[in-house]
């Protein structure tokens, strides 16, 4: 059988098999954000629910202090959705005055922090100009991709404006990762 | 080999190994919806193509009556994209009259139904205000995340307005799930 | 153990087990596109970074000439995000003149090419009308789903307008696939 070798005379080295059910996995859901000190020149990080409702962490994937901690090296699929909501951006008012304008924007970044590396690495970014014309607007940004991570890496979700994040429902704003 | 134990003297319990190819999987694609009766106070559910073109179900993952039926407990990645299209929303007319307005919106919800549980559970929601200014608009909402499901759970996709769903192409509107 | 049989008297056929770490996988990231000849009536294909930064290919998944080459038949999860950016579309000018208008649009298609089949197959499409009112706009389109692919199939990402693709950062525009 592929990937298994029982006869000791064979010298091939096979990657170890492992049960799917014991792989590190997490799905975190939104909680209301409390005002905190943000790092200068860095988008603020969201904190998350990790055990109530739909949220869970398992198989040594731990959540602590806004970070998902990667317990084992390998290729992970990482995803997040952030739903933003706000009032009409200034954009429309400026537009009415006939002047060109820099649009407001909303941005989500999934960031990797490696202790041995001085700078965080931006893995995924979703960024969108917001120049809405209704009095209220709301919209999600979804991200997901596969990355090779090392044991001890930490993942977080940063947003451009924490006060625009819709924290009302666990199905609207979430963050997850699983070892492939 | 990790996850396998042949020596009976070892008392450790290992998670069973299983071939990836026999895991429950489905990718469903859009078909045109015909006017039907909807449940009161619930977004209508889409029905799907499950065997023609790109669509398939395999390894006991069955599609029946708008539901994907989960045949085995475990962690599943679930995803859907719904492309909406419509004519200019009322929003712009109201805006021109200078009054604030509640924007029109489009919403997709992936819902889990558990027979032993009275209320459906909303797993994922993508919701977006639509205040478009062109005469026609179109846009997708994409969702995807991992959830722990139980054998017998049923999944469906609900939308805020079934008549705005773009049913023309199987690559624009779809729904899928696979056991990790 | 499920999927394994050591006793020769059993006649059941089991799907082969395989180590997760040796499955074909790729994550490609954006590079600046150079002007090239496009096929008539087909959206231009993006080319990608496959080894620098966050990008990688592994386990016989190869990237060549805008294509990801599928080395082994099976079910793959395929994903891409393309971030577009542009100046105000004509849409708003036409609107101001009070005439109805056909909106500009942005489209991403993940396409499968099978040598034995004359026509490419569109697996996934994300398409969005763009009728922005700010002087600059930017937004991502994300796609991801599972497909049954055959050894030798080739995958590419096509876009409606290559000049609107944001090529500035590897986390904004990317393309990947992995065998489940």
């Amino acid at each position: 059988l592929k990937g298994q070798e029982f006869a000791p005379s064979h010298q091939q080295v096979y990657a170890p098999l492992r049960a799917d059910g014991d792989k590190p996995r997490a799905h975190l859901t939104v909680v209301r954000q409390t005002p905190t000190q943000h790092f200068k020149n860095q988008f603020p990080a969201l904190h998350w629910e990790h055990e109530l409702g739909l949220a869970f962490t398992k198989n040594r994937m731990n959540y602590t202090n806004k970070f998902l901690l990667i317990p084992e090296s390998g290729d992970y699929f990482i995803y997040s959705q952030v739903t933003f909501r706000g009032m009409t951006s200034e954009c429309s008012e400026i537009r009415q005055a006939g002047r060109p304008n820099k649009p407001d924007s909303i941005t989500v970044v999934i960031t990797k922090v490696t202790d041995s590396y001085p700078e965080p690495t931006q893995l995924l970014m979703g960024t969108k100009s917001v120049c809405e014309v209704g009095s209220n607007w709301f919209q999600p940004i979804y991200l997901g991709a596969m990355f090779s991570l090392q044991e001890g890496d930490k993942l977080m979700v940063n947003v451009s404006d924490i006060s625009l994040v819709d924290y009302t429902k666990e199905d609207k704003t979430f963050f997850g990762a699983f070892l492939l | 080999l990790k996850g396998q134990e042949f020596a009976p003297s070892h008392q450790q319990v290992y998670a069973p190994l299983r071939a990836d190819g026999d895991k429950p999987r489905a990718h469903l694609t859009v078909v045109r919806q015909t006017p039907t009766q909807h449940f009161k106070n619930q977004f209508p559910a889409l029905h799907w193509e499950h065997e023609l073109g790109l669509a398939f179900t395999k390894n006991r993952m069955n599609y029946t009556n708008k539901f994907l039926l989960i045949p085995e407990s475990g962690d599943y990645f679930i995803y859907s994209q719904v492309t909406f299209r419509g004519m200019t929303s009322e929003c712009s007319e109201i805006r021109q009259a200078g009054r604030p307005n509640k924007p029109d919106s489009i919403t997709v919800v992936i819902t889990k139904v558990t027979d032993s549980y009275p209320e459906p559970t909303q797993l994922l929601m993508g919701t977006k205000s639509v205040c478009e200014v062109g005469s026609n608009w179109f846009q997708p909402i994409y969702l995807g995340a991992m959830f722990s499901l139980q054998e017998g759970d049923k999944l469906m996709v609900n939308v805020s307005d079934i008549s705005l769903v773009d049913y023309t192409k199987e690559d624009k509107t779809f729904f899928g799930a696979f056991l990790l | 153990l499920k999927g394994q049989e050591f006793a020769p008297s059993h006649q059941q056929v089991y799907a082969p087990l395989r180590a997760d770490g040796d499955k074909p996988r790729a994550h490609l990231t954006v590079v600046r596109q150079t002007p090239t000849q496009h096929f008539k009536n087909q959206f231009p294909a993006l080319h990608w970074e496959h080894e620098l930064g966050l990008a990688f290919t592994k386990n016989r998944m190869n990237y060549t000439n805008k294509f990801l080459l599928i080395p082994e038949s099976g079910d793959y999860f395929i994903y891409s995000q393309v971030t577009f950016r542009g100046m105000t579309s004509e849409c708003s000018e036409i609107r101001q003149a009070g005439r109805p208008n056909k909106p500009d649009s942005i489209t991403v298609v993940i396409t499968k090419v099978t040598d034995s089949y004359p026509e490419p197959t569109q697996l996934l499409m994300g398409t969005k009308s763009v009728c922005e009112v700010g002087s600059n706009w930017f937004q991502p389109i994300y796609l991801g789903a599972m497909f049954s692919l055959q050894e030798g199939d080739k995958l590419m990402v096509n876009v409606s307008d290559i000049s609107l693709v944001d090529y500035t950062k590897e986390d904004k525009t990317f393309f990947g696939a992995f065998l489940l």
Partner: antibody, heavy 118, light 107 residues
């Protein structure tokens, strides 16, 4: 079974108004757009506009703007189309039609003949 | 407005014939094209949506093809109940418009 039942034939004088009703059954009335399409004798089909029964929002063909009003009464699952300032060339069969998508017409009413004659 | 044209405007055919009707849009309408059948004194009946997809309950002898501006409705083997007028309709943009119709009668 999905059904649309329209009101009976009408004879009107030029300059008058006509209001045609369309009662829906067999589906969720508020879930699908209701369209109105007309057909002059021996002629082709002409789309007049739609109403979203859920919100009451409407979209009229430019040709009928200012003369047509589409309304609905959700309590009785009925849509209405009123055409004012009638002319002789408004003589036609008026159909209501509902679609599973807003851009097509799955089920049609039986039609209401409106004759405009002095 | 998007103009829809059909050809021929009428045709005579026999039972068992293969019949092809074409529809052209004045600008690209992607796949947002529908076909209807209408018999005298009756309301139209929905046949094909999305240019090529058969509405539930419609016989498989009907098929549609095309994308962009040029579309075709084909009846592979004409049956007695197929003698009628056929209309194409674009659902791409406001206002929705119909072709002028193609009348299929008995030769």
């Amino acid at each position: 079974e999905v059904q649309l039942v329209q009101s009976g034939a009408e004879v009107k004088k030029p300059g008058a108004s006509v209001k045609v009703s369309c009662k829906a059954s067999g589906y969720t009335f508020t879930g699908y757009y209701m369209h109105w399409v007309r057909q002059a004798p021996g002629q082709g089909l002409e789309w007049m506009g739609w109403i979203n029964p859920n919100s009451g929002g409407t979209n009229y063909a430019q040709k009928f703007q200012g003369r047509v009003t589409m309304t609905r009464d959700t309590s009785i699952s009925t849509a209405y189309m009123e055409l004012s300032r009638l002319r002789s060339d408004d003589t036609a069969v008026y159909y209501c039609a509902v679609g599973g998508s807003y851009d097509a017409f799955d089920i049609w009413g039986q039609g209401t003949m409106v004759t405009v004659s002095s | 407005d998007i103009q829809m044209t059909q050809s021929p405007s009428s045709l005579s055919a026999s039972v068992g014939d293969r019949v092809t009707i074409t529809c052209r849009a004045s600008q690209s309408i992607s796949s947002y094209l529908n076909w209807y059948q209408q018999k005298p004194g009756k309301a139209p009946k929905f046949l094909i949506y999305g240019a090529s997809r058969l509405q539930s309950g419609v016989p498989s002898r009907f098929s549609g093809s095309g994308s962009g501006t040029d579309f075709t409705l084909t009846i592979s083997s004409l049956q007695p109940e197929d003698f009628a007028t056929y209309y194409c309709q674009q659902g791409y943009s406001n206002p929705f418009t119909f072709g002028p119709g193609t009348k299929v009668d008995i030769k």
